[in-house]
Amino acid sequence: APVPPGEDSKDVAAPHRQPLTSSERIDKQIRYILDGISALRKETCNKSNMCESSKEALAENNLNLPKMAEKDGCFQSGFNEETCLVKIITGLLEFEVYLEYLQNRFESSEEQARAVQMSTKVLIQFLQKKAKNLDAITTPDPTTNASLLTKLQAQNQWLQDMTTHLILRSFKEFLQSSLRALRQM
């Protein structure tokens, strides 16, 4: 698994470098997670043809994966820093159950899947420090998450491969949108 941000050899070898600002640290953390997702997607796409055929193989996707919408204030038109930050944090908290599902779904990238999960937890902490309105952030219900996890894990192999592909694709899109929005803050 890649080394988490702030622990690579370059950082150790350059003590004179200015410490990262909060925004830079968040930016770096997201890019680190995106690299991890790329590695996981590579394994998923090599293992099955889900990546090409997912559209025509599905009639409906009821996974309720977090997605950015106009009302969330994260797009250039109608940008709203506070609303957007709440959406990013809420979305990441909602993704956590899906990231838990991804554990044990990978053979050669098991550590990578764990790194993505742990780095996302760290990212949430960074963002929560940045947010002023923590009361507006709704935490997912643990009981609902537990039953969703059980349901996803009970699916057959084909559906589990499809679920894995959809989670990775959605999480990548969500993080890319978050990264663009956070760079405006």
Epitope: L58, E60, N62, L63, K151, L152, A154, N156, L159, L166
Partner: nanobody, 124 residues
């Protein structure tokens, strides 16, 4: 587990209608997305139609759109396929399938439970 028994097949003329039924055992029938697939001799099993859990949404293969209608009666644990304006190319063994998943597939591997199949033959 769910057991599916499909019925209603037969030999009909082109342009005729037929209604297939699929009876399911199991108390949680309404949790399952129900689909119909068909398989003609020497061909792969192909998607025909699917209806979502509560029956709110339906999806069809392009080849049957406007001619076939899928419906379900959760009180009777049964799903139906009304087939109108039948064509010789609709000749196949029709299978009913079920899955309890947030994903509703149009691929046979997305289904866990299958009926035994009912033969539909359309003569010209």
């Amino acid at each position: 587990a769910v057991q599916l028994v499909d019925s209603g097949g037969g030999l009909v003329q082109a342009g005729d209608s037929l209604r297939l039924s699929c009876a399911a055992s199991g108390r949680t029938f309404s949790n399952y997305a129900m689909a119909w697939f068909r398989q003609a001799p020497g061909k792969e099993r192909e998607f025909v139609a699917v209806i979502s859990y509560a029956g709110g949404r339906t999806y069809y293969a392009d080849s049957v759109k406007g001619r076939f209608t899928i419906s379900r009666d959760n009180a009777k644990n049964t799903v139906y396929l009304q087939m109108n304006s039948l064509k010789p190319e609709d000749t196949a063994v029709y299978y009913c399938a079920a899955v309890d998943s947030p994903l509703i597939a149009t691929h046979p591997r997305g289904y866990d439970y299958w009926g035994q199949g009912t033969q539909v033959t359309v003569s010209s």
